[in-house]
Interface confidence: low
């Protein structure tokens, strides 16, 4: 089992364990790491292989989504003999190598976390010249990526039979809380709408009927912290329209 | 010498819950996975769980998720397997193991009875 | 979950013979990252615990005698003993090293006539 999974780091080819076997290929990444938008994060990972003195040319590769197939996220390569392992491709210019591949170590530093970044991440050598040999990590290490919530939109729409609806949006994880306020409403969730798929840090919250006019607000809140946005309903009267 | 040096027997009554150790040593314990491998009476070997006790990481079968919790204390060096809602089919060696080194621990009997 | 199926559940040997036994995964155990399969054979003995044997469906751990093969590719593999001593009398389990949860067959027992 361990062979495929247990994967461990590079100071342990050092300790003196007489039943140890020859080394095999293994990676060691954890389940999660999490870390807050805004911040940056570190996503370990640290190999064995079974060429005990490989010296060749090498690149480590980060990719993100699934194993093998997804796009990479970060690129770099050290030539024969180098401990340098120099950039060739850093997404956005986020990504940056904290290990030394040359130690078995692939570990990598992700700059100014956003929730976008939230998702998995798998790291793989590449060894070349006299030995051809590589190995990727199956799978891989959750980035988790927390968030305050914000309110990314608030607004007052049409409805039917000269309503009017209010909607407010925010984002955050874990997803946020939302509750509108305002006239004659109390504290209400209204109706929140499930984080639709492939934007699951957002969630929506509507009143479908506003009967007064006035100031709505609406909080959102999570275990990070609140945010509050307000929409102003002032309704002509007579007409149908609205001021907001 | 690696070594993993396991509890001794244990008779247990139904519904009650035990609590299993495993002693390493010879080796960085922070820095391998400990597995636990459950064999009934005359049967085949069951994949229960491991534990990284670097930082405490578990992966777990599903089958034994609510079986079964794992911990590790770094001041020790031991492993420990936790066993709930015990029945008899809970009746079994349960093993520990570093796959790494293929060391196995000799094994603790669990027997389930009233 | 990967399912292993091994055959026979049991194989009755003279010293000196030559033994094949078989094992099959539910699915491909064949890792494209490094073209590896992740099937390992185990030895146990009565009243001890398993020993590893194979790995990576084919490569001998330091210290087994060359007499154990093992072969195969994705989701058939089996496990040879040329020239069985009384010394190799246990039961044999396949186990998919793959992915979560690892399996393991219910073994095929080697006896001695």
């Known amino acids: 089992f361990v062979r495929t999974k247990i994967d461990t780091t590079e100071n342990l080819l050092n300790t003196e364990v007489h039943s140890s076997p020859a080394q095999r290929w293994s990676m060691q990444v954890p389940p999660e790491v999490s870390a807050e938008a805004g911040d940056a994060a570190v996503l370990p990972c640290t190999f064995t292989h079974p060429h005990r003195h490989y010296d060749g040319p090498l690149t480590a590769i980060w990719r993100a989504g699934e194993p093998y197939a997804g796009p990479q996220v970060f690129r770099c390569a050290a030539a024969r003999g180098s401990e340098l392992c120099q950039t060739a491709l850093s997404l956005h210019g986020r990504f940056r190598l904290l290990g030394n591949p040359r130690r078995n170590d692939l570990s990598l530093r992700v700059e100014r976390l956003a929730l976008a970044d939230d998702r998995r991440y798998f790291c793989r050598v590449e060894f070349a010249g006299d030995v051809h040999d590589r190995y990727e990590s199956r799978h891989g290490v959750r980035l988790h990526v927390t968030a305050a919530p914000r309110i990314v939109n608030i607004s007052v729409l049409p409805s039917p039979a000269h309503a009017f609806r209010a909607l407010c949006t925010a984002e955050g994880e874990p997803p946020p809380a939302l509750a509108w306020s305002g006239p004659a409403l109390g504290n209400s969730l209204a109706a929140v709408r499930s984080p639709r798929e492939g934007h699951g840090h957002l969630v929506t919250a509507e009143l479908p009927a506003l009967t007064h006019d006035g100031r709505y607000t609406c909080t959102a809140a999570n275990s990070l912290g609140r945010s509050e946005a307000s929409v102003y309903l002032f309704r002509f009267h007579g007409a149908s329209g609205a001021s907001t | 010498q690696v070594q993993l040096k396991q509890s001794g027997a244990e008779l247990v009554r139904p519904g009650a819950s035990v609590k299993l150790s495993c002693k390493a040593s010879g080796y960085t314990f922070t820095d391998y996975y400990i597995n636990w491998v459950k064999q009934r009476p005359g049967q085949g070997l069951e994949w229960i769980a491991r534990?990284?006790?670097?930082?405490?990481?578990?992966d777990y079968n599903e089958k034994f998720k609510d079986k079964a919790t794992l911990t590790a204390e770094k001041s020790s060096t031991t492993a420990y397997i936790q066993l709930s809602s015990l029945t008899s089919e809970d009746s079994a060696v349960y093993f520990c193991?570093?796959?790494?080194?293929?060391?196995w621990g000799t094994g603790t009997t669990v027997t389930v009875s009233s | 979950d990967i399912v292993m199926t091994q055959s026979p559940s049991s194989l009755t040997v003279t010293a000196g013979e030559k033994v094949t036994m078989s094992c099959k995964s539910s699915q491909s155990l064949l890792n494209s990252g490094n073209q590896k399969n992740y099937l390992t054979w185990y030895q146990q003995k009565p009243g001890q615990p398993p020993k590893l044997l194979i790995y990576?469906?084919?490569t001998r751990e330091s210290g087994v005698p060359d007499r154990f093969t093992g072969s195969g590719s994705g989701t058939d593999f089996t496990l040879t003993i040329s020239n069985v001593q009384p010394e190799d009398l246990a039961v044999y389990y396949c186990?998919?090293?793959?992915?979560?949860?690892?399996?393991f067959g219910s073994g095929t027992e080697l006896e001695m006539k």
């Open positions: 186990q998919n090293d793959y992915s979560f949860p690892f399996t």
């Open positions: 193991c570093l796959w790494y080194f293929d060391v």
């Open positions: 990576w469906a084919s």
């Open positions: 534990i990284y006790p670097g930082n405490g990481n578990t």
